[in-house]
Interface confidence: medium
């Protein structure tokens, strides 16, 4: 039978590191906490897209806090050669697009998307929530952006920023993009509350994108998705104060803060400044 046929067909992971989707806490503001110590720490600044120094008071605060610049970069910028995406100007897909889907060993059963190299399309699969590989996207759009051939040979990132084919630069200030690539805050903020599969009843908050507010829900203790915060404040930080405004179809994306045009690399899920 088919199971016996598969006995010797084992899907092996590749040299690439596993996918870790951009963490919600990388979008949190630096939080020095209520204590009075003076401790040099680093946080990821979503506006400059760089890891920067701040003074931490020594208690509480949030998870966007790292002991070293390297740790911060490793966690929030993914500045890693294996993860840098070759743009479609060279008509190349990143290597991880060719990996088989990998559910991982855990039992979260989260809907994710992977690029199927046989059908040349992004398809849905169930991810367990841990381990796995990089061919794993939270939304169909993300998967298409990264692994399917984009329109006109452009690689379009999730912030609606388009690569300029002439000078290899990005213009994030005011870019017309197809409605498919509209930005509505971090992708997990758009997902519904997900209790998960276990039996606990923990008080958590999720961002309700319909009403634009953080609301409480009961979390089971395992699985679920990233739209899951231990406090309303954390929820608001991550989702309510999205740094790119909502837009109507065909409209312009405008950042809330002006930024200088920067030469950047296109990379999975994020824009990275060179030589950070």
């Amino acid at each position: 039978d088919s199971e016996e046929d598969e006995e010797h067909t084992i899907i092996t992971d590749t040299e690439l590191p596993p996918l870790k989707l951009m963490h919600s806490f990388c979008a949190f503001k630096a939080d020095d906490g209520p204590c009075k110590a003076i401790m040099k720490r680093f946080f990821f600044n979503i506006f400059t897209r760089q890891c920067e120094e701040f003074i931490y008071g020594g208690c509480e605060g949030n998870q966007n806090r790292f002991e070293s610049l390297e740790e911060c970069k490793k966690m929030c910028t993914r500045d890693n050669a294996n993860r840098i995406i070759k743009t479609t100007l060279q008509q190349e897909k990143p290597d991880f697009c060719f990996l088989e889907e990998d559910p991982g060993i855990c039992r979260g059963y989260i809907t994710r998307y992977f690029y199927n190299n046989q059908t040349k399309q992004c398809e849905r699969f169930k991810y367990g929530g841990c381990l796995g590989n990089m061919n794993n996207f939270e939304t169909l759009e993300e998967c298409k952006n990264i692994c399917e051939d984009g329109p006109n040979g452009f690689q379009v990132d999730n912030y609606g920023t388009q690569l300029n084919a002439v000078n290899n630069s990005l213009t994030p200030q005011s870019t017309k993009v197809p409605s498919l690539f509209e930005f509505h805050g971090p992708s997990w903020c758009l997902t519904p509350a997900d209790r998960g599969l276990c039996r606990a009843n923990e008080n958590r908050f999720y961002y309700n994108s319909v009403i634009g507010k953080c609301r409480p829900f009961k979390y089971s203790g395992c699985g679920g998705n990233e739209n899951n915060f231990t406090s309303k404040q954390e929820c608001l930080r991550a989702c309510k104060k999205g740094f790119i405004q909502r837009i109507s179809k065909g409209g312009l994306i405008k950042t809330k803060r002006k930024r200088k045009k920067q030469r950047v690399k296109i990379a999975y899920e994020e824009i990275f400044v060179k030589n950070m």
């Epitope: 199971e3 598969e6 006995e7 067909t9 084992i10 899907i11 092996t12 992971d13 590191p17 596993p18 870790k20 963490h23 806490f25 998870q63 740790e71 490793k74 966690m75 990998d102 559910p103 060993i105 855990c106 039992r107 979260g108 367990g128 929530g129 841990c130 381990l131 796995g132 590989n133 276990c198 203790g221 395992c222 699985g223």
Partner: antibody
Framework: QVQLQQSGPGLVKPSQTLSLTCAIS??????????WGWIRQSPGRGLEWLGF?????????SYAVSVKSRITINPDTSKNQFSLQLNSVTPEDTAVYYC???????????WGQGTLVTVSS | DIVLTQSPATLSLSPGERATLSCRAS???????LAWYQQKPGQAPRLLIY???SRATGVPARFSGSGSGTDFTLTISSLEPEDFATYYC?????????FGQGTKVEIK
């Protein structure tokens, strides 16, 4: 209660292949809710995860980069066991090797008794 | 790889005392996927805590786990003679799964 019973030689010559087997009772190697892995422990390196195999819609495996070019973990559904093969061993591969069941949400909840493998000529 | 650093390396306490063991990750780890193990000489590790705070089957209530992000703690509220052992944390959030170097709890 899941039980894991390890078997295999305790002495392997350098450049040869280390082979260990882990027999499972109380669960199935094809279980949809677990992974079956190998961990080793040596004074110099502590506990080191080597890799595991697991079945969902098909078989998958995942290996530590440090041994990736040399390791194979295979299931044997007919005997309800899984095996470790580590090629081209050196004295640095001397360690106590454990097989373990990694629960889908709950850590490594069952372990084999451990096998001290010495790599020496 | 995610590096887990346990502290202290050795903890010298008397029976009845409270033990607090720390596990710090080099990157944030989902609290769903952090486990603690106990190991005695000549034995395989034994799962104590999974999901950072859930006790495994048969583990006494004096063992508790807490933490999130990069900082996790195993607490033994009142040490029993059989608790003197080495304790390891493990993350299975990101490939490869990694272990801490261990904390030995010894009798003072």
């Amino acid at each position: 209660q899941v039980q894991l019973q390890q078997s295999g030689p305790g002495l392997v010559k350098p450049s040869q292949t280390l082979s260990l087997t882990c027999a499972i009772s109380g669960d199935s190697v094809s279980s949809n809710g677990a992974a079956w892995g190998w961990i080793r422990q040596s004074p110099g390196r502590g506990l080191e995860w080597l890799g595991f195999i697991y079945r969902r819609s098909k078989w998958y495996n995942s290996y530590a980069v440090s041994v990736k070019s040399r390791i194979t973990i295979n299931p044997d559904t007919s005997k309800n066991q899984f095996s470790l093969q580590l090629n081209s061993v050196t004295p640095e591969d001397t360690a106590v090797y454990y097989c373990a069941r990694q629960d889908g949400m709950g850590g490594m909840d069952s372990w084999g008794q451990g096998t001290l493998v010495t790599v020496s000529s | 790889d995610i590096v887990l650093t346990q502290s202290p390396a050795t903890l010298s306490l008397s029976p009845g005392e409270r033990a607090t063991l720390s596990c710090r990750a080099s990157q944030s780890v989902s609290s769903f996927y952090l486990a603690w193990y106990q190991q005695k000489p000549g034995q395989a590790p034994r799962l104590l805590i999974y999901g950072s705070s859930s006790r495994a089957t048969g583990v006494p209530a004096r063992f508790s786990g807490s933490g999130s992000g990069t900082d996790f703690t195993l607490t033994i509220s009142s040490l029993e003679p059989e608790d003197f052992a080495t304790y390891y944390c493990q993350q299975y959030d990101s490939t490869p799964s990694t272990f801490g170097q261990g904390t030995k709890v010894e009798i003072k």
